[in-house]
């Protein structure tokens, strides 16, 4: 999906209002310096592409993020504020959620959510030059 035509300001507002807090809740008890940010993005559409991938695509050691509150809100935000955000994407997230039976917070998931926090922060500062 091409995120170019999303309402970035509304998505940013949703992140600042609620999604960021849900991410912090998920990470509670983890030191902010515990993980190095290895995933980056260059502009807002690219950031949303990476955010969607990390949020909804299971990875080795962490197949369990799609049912978290921050993920549900991310999905809702994209469905409302990204015109034509495809049913394929939505259906893919549903499939990810069905595959998982119980909530398990692994260290790998914490690392992945730490990467997500970095991507969201980058999304909120689109004019900053890439390091």
């Amino acid at each position: 999906y091409d995120f170019t035509n999303c309402d970035f300001e509304k998505i940013k507002a949703a992140y600042l209002s609620t999604i960021s807090k849900d991410l912090i809740t998920y990470m509670s008890g983890t030191k902010s310096t515990e993980f190095n940010n290895t995933v980056s993005c260059s502009n807002r559409p690219h950031c949303l592409t990476e955010i969607q991938s990390l949020t909804f695509n299971p990875t080795a050691g962490c197949a369990s993020l799609a049912k978290e509150m921050f993920a549900m809100k991310t999905k809702a935000a994209l469905a409302i504020w990204c015109p034509g955000y495809s049913e394929t994407q939505i259906n893919a997230t549903q499939a990810m959620k069905k595959r998982r039976k119980r909530k398990v917070t692994t260290n790998k998931c914490l690392e992945q959510v730490s990467q997500l926090q970095g991507l969201w922060r980058r999304f909120n500062r689109p004019l900053l030059k890439q390091q």
Epitope: A14, S17, I19, A76, A79, I80, E87, I90
Partner: nanobody
Framework: EVQLVESGGGLVQPGGSLRLSCAAS????????MGWFRQAPGKEREFVAW???????DYADSVKGRFTISADNSKNTAYLQMNSLKPEDTAVYYC?????????????WGQGTLVTVSS
């Protein structure tokens, strides 16, 4: 001004069904999604389900497979069909614009509709 009016609640036995309605004025599904939320006595308000104008839906784990959200765009009304009800579904049910939920609100919730599941 946006107005949302919930109805359809009542007393039902465990295993029973209810259908809630949310009539909206001042907002259309074209520009937002409608969601159902609930608040049980002594608990925080929680997300139940949402639907947008393309029929995309999402559900809380606790209701998936038992509740179905739908909408009639021509009537600007959202529905929540609740089947296989359990005592833990007892709560006041509210509808709201999903955008407001994402943005930390709504500041003013409607009166809601009470669902009591008890034998």
């Amino acid at each position: 001004e946006v107005q949302l009016v919930e109805s359809g609640g009542g007393l039902v036995q465990p295993g029973g069904s209810l259908r809630l309605s949310c009539a909206a004025s001042g907002v259309t599904l074209d520009t937002d999604a409608m969601g159902w939320f609930r608040q049980a006595p002594g608990k925080e308000r929680e997300f139940v389900a949402w639907i947008n104008n393309r029929g995309t839906t999402d559900y809380a784990d606790s209701v998936k497979g038992r509740f179905t959200i739908s909408a009639d765009n021509s009537k600007n009304t959202a529905y929540l069909q609740m089947n296989s009800l359990k005592p833990e579904d007892t709560a006041v049910y509210y509808c709201a614009r999903v955008s407001q939920w994402l943005l930390g609100g709504p500041a003013n919730w409607g009166q809601g509709t009470l669902v009591t599941v008890s034998s």
